[in-house]
């Protein structure tokens, strides 16, 4: 057949699996003058075998993993043996079977953790090999827990990274694992090839013992530290500590304060630094950060709260310079005059800032002193002694001594008398008759002007007039303004007109005075007014019922989930419809009659939180008016990302020959969210076949060394494979590549002779 | 047995041409290529090209061109050389030799024709 | 073309002793088979040429093993060990790796 199995001399390339007894020849090549025979030469192994006609077969089954890849030439050669075409690569690439089981490096692993680790943090690796093509089931290796001795209540407290071997604590196991309740665990782990996959998959097991040590890194309790402190700073309130030795410690102000007034040393010893005063705050949180030596965070802050303890460092003030109360004539004994009530900055409910009123001087004393007393505690002041007479004392000036247990302040009060409260405010109108306003009329337009007279003392409580509406607008769409000097009445408007709720409304005002009438004096019929006011209709739009809505979920939603709903009103009852605008992703739908909206394809958080479009509502019917609400979409981070090269690392190279072993730095990220502490990814090589020429370093949670395991490297590019794994919930691994090339210099540069195209790397190490 | 029996020696005028005959004999012709070579008296040997019979494929030395043709004839399994424009230049003994096609060796020559140019 | 030198044009020997010609080519003569590609043969006075070696070390039929042939892939080496009197004669080293096949200049083995 020719073409598949026949043809002339090119290079090609042939699948074979392994472990197969040979059952058909590879290919016929064809000669062509001179050309009379074929030669064969390259990794033969001695199976690969050409007749002189040109047939290519091989005498025996193939390993892979003896050699995965065997690369011939074939050339073709004239009656003296002489080369007149080729050679021609013909490279045999031997395809894998499941014919090695995996088997794990060690039978016994042993291991320790810290209570309260962070789930899915690694603190140990198992590790299996499995010598068949990790590109295929056949060499994708799966981990398991098998068992967890001991299994209390049923909740497993360690997990594995089926990919990679790594071994963590969950959330139960970083809450509930307690050295002091159990100190070691057991676990069996299990690896199969296949994937795990297959029912037909070899598998290993290994052992692996773990101690849990204990975790101090804890926050302490609450410290309380008395304010205005005279003794001498730094002072030392508290202290932390990090599980091993070398940690850098600082402290993190969460509220941004001008004035920080605490320290922490090197060794965790937590310090105020100047003395504190509760009247300015009372309180303070802050954080406490453990780092290593490259600045990564080794665990979640500690939060450190600051209790401030109040001393009697505030005197009691008094509300204004002179306190003003007025008096009848006539009024009773024992009557209310008014209260005065001081201040005292010191801690609320204690005796620092508990008051004692006491009057120590009254002018004049006419008729007589002691006409006035004050509750000691309350500030109010009452008539003692006799009913006053405005003609014999207008006004009496009080001194009082305000008094916490520390302090004492003089107030100073004065007390008008006055005439008696004994004429009652008229309307000059009872109905203000019929007012016909829009609904959208605006807020603040003053509408009606009313007014009442009083006939008591003026420019007193007496005389005064506060009006009310008492009747017919129960939304308190309405409000009166007094000008003082007239007693004049401006009804304006409060709130939104409504038509729809109110087409009609009957007012009715009250007059009244700030002053008690005299015993026997009573408002009737004159103090009160009404008035009708009539709304007329004007169209208006729906009206949402919030500015702005708000849901919250997470980015890794099923479609068609329901993520949120808005609402909206027609004030004239018409149906609404809702619609999106601005949904530039195209992520959101929403129902056009509930308002509920939901997802019609995969969120993203990396592509921007929170999401935000806008919802429209618009009326069904009349005149289809609309209006525009905001619908903010927050997504919650799921780890969707798996970690990648931060960079761009092309053009790395190394001086060939090597003088000795080097190393480069590399940087690894990933999309997801990292909060306090950052990312925390883990390295290792891509392949065992690279374990003899390089090893990778874990520097910190974000960088890594690659190094190189000795000089014997050719000149040329090695690609090198490194498998980053993120660690998170589930954890995400990334294989990477970084080129390497060893190539010859001049003055610390890669030599490339002139016309050499490729790309010429740029950074030596 | 093998054998290449070659002609007879030749006396030419300058100018002439002359065609050597190499008869095989004692192995498949077709399956083998014939190859001539030149040795002036006293002098060391240089290689003149080659004649496969089975395609009838030949190879000259280009300093050779023009100057020799290599042809065969299966039925009565002979090669043959022509030298044309002959000169005192060509007064030499021409061998021919068999290459053989597995391991490649020049294992059997022919006695050799010697060739003499003279006015 | 490939240029085939024979420093020596003669080398005299006592008949038993034993004796080494040598040969070199201006270009590799090792093809990536592993393969050699070098003749060496001997002009007895008045007779063709005979294959002694073939592919730089391989001893061609009928050739007595006193006959050895080594070299790398430009210098080449023919031994006669306890040379005899039939030996006499102009030896040559030819490369067939490429065309045109190209001969030594040869070396006269000559009897003190």
């Known amino acids: 057949q020719e073409g598949k199995f026949s043809g002339p001399l090119k290079p090609m390339t042939f699948s074979i699996y392994e472990g197969q007894e040979p059952s058909q020849i590879i290919f016929q090549f064809k000669a062509n003058p001179p050309a009379v025979t074929f030669e064969l030469t390259g990794e033969t192994d001695n199976i690969f075998v050409i007749e002189r006609e040109g047939l290519l077969y091989y005498n025996r089954a193939l390993d892979r993993e003896t050699r995965s890849t065997h690369n011939l030439q074939v050339a073709a050669l004239d009656a003296n043996g002489i080369i007149v075409e080729g050679p021609v690569p013909i490279t045999i690439k031997v395809k894998d079977i499941n014919d090695n089981r995996p088997t794990f490096l060690q039978s016994k692993y042993e291991g320790s953790v810290r209570q309260n680790s962070r789930p899915g943090k690694p603190f140990l690796y198992v590790n299996a090999t499995d010598l068949d093509d990790p590109a295929t089931p056949n060499g994708q290796l799966y981990y398991q827990i098998v068992i967890q001795l001991p299994m209390i209540n049923n909740v497993m407290y360690f997990q594995i990274n089926n990919k990679t071997g790594a071994i963590s604590l969950t959330r139960e196991g970083s809450q509930e694992l307690n050295p002091a309740k159990n100190p070691s665990y057991n676990l069996v782990i299990s690896v199969k090839d296949m994937g795990g996959q297959s029912e037909n998959s070899f598998s290993d097991t290994t052992s692996v013992d773990i101690i849990v040590t204990e975790n101090i890194w804890k926050a302490p309790k609450p410290v309380e530290m008395v304010e205005n402190s005279t003794d001498p700073h730094p002072i030392k309130i508290t202290q932390v500590r990090w599980n091993d030795p070398g940690a850098q410690y600082s402290l993190v102000d969460k509220e941004k304060l001008p004035r920080f007034p605490f320290s922490i040393d090197q060794e965790g010893d937590i310090y105020v630094t100047q003395p504190l005063d509760r009247e300015e705050k009372d309180a303070y949180v802050f954080y406490a950060v453990a780092k290593d030596e490259y600045g990564k965070p080794l665990s979640y802050p500690l939060e450190i709260h600051v209790k401030v303890k109040d001393i009697n460092d505030n005197p009691p003030t008094c509300p204004s310079p002179v306190t003003v109360f007025e008096v009848q004539e006539n009024e009773r004994l024992g009557n209310s005059i008014g209260t005065l009530t001081a201040h005292d900055r010191d801690e609320e409910n204690t005796a620092n800032s508990f008051l004692n009123y006491r009057i120590v001087e009254q002018t004049p004393k006419l008729p007589m002193d002691g006409l006035f007393l004050i509750q000691t505690y309350a500030g109010m002041l009452q008539l003692a002694k006799q009913s006053l007479k405005k003609q014999d004392t207008p006004q009496y000036n009080l001194t009082i001594e305000v008094s916490d247990k520390d302090f004492k302040t003089l107030c100073f009060v004065q007390i008008n008398v006055i005439d008696i409260n004994d004429q009652i405010p008229i309307f000059e109108k009872s109905d203000y008759g019929n007012l016909t306003l829009a609904e959208d009329t605006n807020i603040g337009s003053t509408i009606l002007t009313i007014q009442a007279t009083d006939a008591d003392e003026p420019f007193t409580g007496s005389s005064k007039i506060l009006y009310h509406i008492i009747k017919g607008d129960s939304e308190g769409r309405l409000g009166v303004d007094t000008d003082p000097h007239t007693n004049t009445g401006y009804v304006i408007i409060k709130k939104p007109l409504d038509f729809e709720t109110a087409a009609v409304s009957n007012i009715v005002f009250k007059a009244e005075n700030p002053e008690p009438l005299v015993f026997g004096v009573k408002y009737n019929a004159s103090s009160f007014a009404k008035f009708t006011l009539i709304v007329t209709d004007v169209n208006e739009a729906p009206q949402f019922s919030q500015h702005v809505f708000q849901a919250k979920v997470s980015e890794d939603v099923a479609i068609g989930t329901k993520v949120g709903n808005v609402t909206a009103k027609d004030p004239e009852g018409l149906d609404i419809s809702y619609s999106l605008r601005g949904d530039t992703r195209g992520w959101l739908k929403i129902d056009h009659v509930t308002g509920e909206i939901f997802s019609v394809a995969p969120l993203d958080r990396e592509a921007g939180s929170p999401y935000r479009v806008q919802v429209v509502a618009t009326e069904v019917g009349g005149s289809s008016l609309s209006s525009v609400s905001e619908f903010h979409l927050i997504l919650m981070d799921v780890n969707d990302n798996p970690p990648r090269l931060a960079k761009d690392y092309t053009g790395l190279f190394f001086c060939h020959p090597l003088s000795a072993p080097g190393s480069l730095i590399f940087e690894a990220t990933d999309d997801d969210q990292h909060l306090f502490r950052g990312p925390h990814f883990t390295f290792s090589l891509g392949s065992g076949s690279l374990q003899n020429d390089w090893e990778v370093s874990k520097i910190n949670g974000t960088h890594a060394r690659l190094s190189t395991r000795h000089t014997e490297f050719e000149e040329r590019e090695y690609v090198v494979l490194i498998r980053i794994n993120d660690g998170g919930r589930p954890p995400l691994e990334g294989i990477v590549s970084l080129p390497v090339t060893f190539c010859s210099c001049v003055e610390g540069s890669c030599f490339r002779p002139a016309g050499h195209q490729t790309g010429i790397p740029t950074v030596g190490m | 047995q093998v054998q290449l029996q070659q002609s007879e020696a030749e006396l030419v005028k300058p100018g002439a041409s002359v065609k050597l005959s190499c008869k095989a004999s004692?192995?498949?012709?077709?399956?083998?290529?014939i190859h001539w070579m030149k040795q002036r008296p006293e002098q060391g040997l240089e290689w003149i090209g080659y004649?496969?019979?089975?395609?009838?494929?030949?190879k000259v030395n280009e300093k050779f061109k023009g100057k020799a043709t290599l042809t065969a004839d299966t039925s009565s399994s002979t090669a043959y050389m022509q030298l044309n424009s002959l000169t005192s230049e060509d007064s030499a003994v021409y061998f021919c030799?068999?290459?053989?096609?597995?391991?490649?060796?020049?294992?059997?020559w022919g006695q050799g024709t010697s060739v003499t140019v003279s006015s | 073309d490939i240029v085939m030198t024979q420093a020596a044009p003669s080398v005299p020997v006592t008949p038993g002793e034993s004796v080494s010609i040598s040969c070199r080519s201006s270009?590799?003569?090792?093809?990536?088979?592993?393969?050699?590609?070098l003749y060496w043969f001997l002009q007895r006075p008045g007779q063709s040429p005979q294959l002694l070696i073939y592919?730089?070390?391989n001893l061609a039929s009928g050739v007595p093993d006193r006959f050895s042939g080594s070299g790398s892939g430009t210098a080449f080496t023919l031994r006669i060990s306890r040379v005899e009197a039939e030996d006499v004669g102009v030896y040559y080293c030819?490369?067939?790796?490429?065309?045109?096949?190209?001969f030594g200049g040869g070396t006269k083995l000559e009897i003190k």
């Open positions: 030799a068999r290459m053989t096609n597995y391991l490649y060796i020049m294992d059997y």
């Open positions: 004692g192995y498949t012709f077709t399956d083998h290529a």
């Open positions: 004649i496969y019979p089975r395609d009838d494929f030949a």
């Open positions: 270009k590799s003569l090792l093809r990536s088979n592993g393969n050699t590609y």
């Open positions: 592919r730089m070390s």
């Open positions: 030819m490369q067939h790796l490429e065309y045109p096949f190209t």
